[in-house]
């Protein structure tokens, strides 16, 4: 199907409190319907985003309003096609205690790529 | 422009079985989700299930799983909630949504806007 | 199952300012929405996530979030605005969504 699924970036630290997008940009397919996993388990999440850049490029947003110490880990999206599971390269989302000054570190995948967005 | 064509008001026995739908209209059906709402009357607003997009997964609120089934046809454009076998509890205004609203962050699919006019499922013997 | 509590009634003079409050355990990891819904008609949105007003809706309508509390603010309270209000969010796990139980607002 010349499906291409990535997250990006491949590492991000957050402080403990703050909101956070992690993205997922799927190319080659319609309205896909995205699932996010964290650590093997698929994340429920009914209020997450989307943006359609174009008919077969769509990108995704798994929204968290509020990071606590529950929320680290590895994240990873995943569409259906045809039958299978494409699953995107995973995040590794860390925290820094409330009040640090948290940074992130992005290594692209695609130049096209943005970054996570971090406004509520 | 939107719009979400619900089909009409019905009277049925306790233990009959339902199926309304809702058509839409204005705007690429798989774009967006449906999702239902229940009113009991004078009462208020209970969220009862999302269908996503391609209708591969549903979404259903507690008092509803297994009693209803959300589900739709992309062919033409139309969301379904059907019941086995109705009660008299069931008696209610039921909304479909169109689940999903342009903001400047994106689609976010549980911004309610597009609100059908409702269908009323009227339950008694 | 997963609850989100509002008080049943509000009541302000015009020109006031009215405050409905929803409350909720998971609120503090989960974004609240905001319905007004006037007699015999369908309900409207009027804030998202939290804060974002909808597209349509007059500048008096606001939002806020703090800890297990979300908050509709009307600042200058009008006839029209009279309705019941509902907040909206999803459950903790995050697969099913929830309605308040609604509060009337009155305007007189």
């Known amino acids: 199907a010349g499906l291409k699924l990535m997250g990006a970036p491949v590492k991000l630290t957050v402080s403990q409190g703050q909101p956070v997008k992690l993205n997922c940009s799927v190319e080659g397919m319609e309205e896909p319907d995205i699932q996010w996993v964290k650590d093997g388990a698929v994340v429920q999440n009914l209020d997450q985003l989307y943006i359609p850049v174009s008919e077969q490029h769509w990108i995704g947003f798994l929204s968290l309003k509020s990071v606590e110490r529950s929320d680290a880990g590895r994240y990873w999206c995943q569409v259906e096609d045809g039958g299978e599971t494409e699953i995107s390269q995973p995040v590794w989302l860390t925290l820094v205690p409330r009040g640090s000054s948290a940074h992130h570190h992005h290594h692209h995948h695609h130049s096209a790529w943005s970054h996570p967005q971090f406004e509520k | 422009e939107v719009q979400l064509v619900q089909s009409g008001a019905d009277v049925k026995k306790p233990g009959a079985s339902l199926t309304i739908s809702c058509q839409a209209s204005?705007?690429?059906?798989?774009?967006?989700?449906i999702s239902w709402v229940r009113q009991k009357p004078g009462k208020g607003l209970e969220w009862m299930g999302r269908i996503s997009r391609h209708g591969s997964q549903t979404y259903y609120g507690p008092s509803f799983q297994g009693h209803v089934t959300i589900s739709a046809d992309r062919s033409t454009a139309t969301a379904y909630l059907q019941w086995r076998s109705l009660e008299a509890s069931d008696t209610a205004m039921y909304y479909c949504?169109?689940?999903?609203?342009?903001?400047?962050?994106?689609?976010?699919?549980?911004?309610?806007?597009?609100w059908g006019p409702g269908t009323l499922v009227t339950v008694s013997s | 199952s997963y609850e989100l509590t509002q008080p049943p009634s509000v009541s302000v003079s015009p020109g006031q300012t009215a405050r409905i409050t929803c409350s909720g355990d998971a609120l503090p990891k989960k974004y609240a929405y905001w319905y007004q819904q006037k007699s015999g008609q369908a309900p409207v949105l009027v804030i998202y996530?939290?804060?974002k007003r909808a597209s349509g809706i007059p500048e008096r309508f606001s939002g806020s979030s703090s800890g297990t509390m979300a908050t509709l603010t009307i600042s200058g309270a009008q006839v029209e605005d009279e309705a019941d209000y509902y907040c909206y969010s999803i459950s903790p796990a995050g697969n099913y969504g929830v309605f308040g139980g609604g509060t009337k607002l009155t305007v007189l």
């Open positions: 204005g705007y690429t059906f798989t774009d967006y989700w």
């Open positions: 996530e939290d804060h």
């Open positions: 949504v169109r689940a999903g609203g342009q903001t400047s962050g994106g689609t976010i699919p549980e911004y309610y806007q597009h």
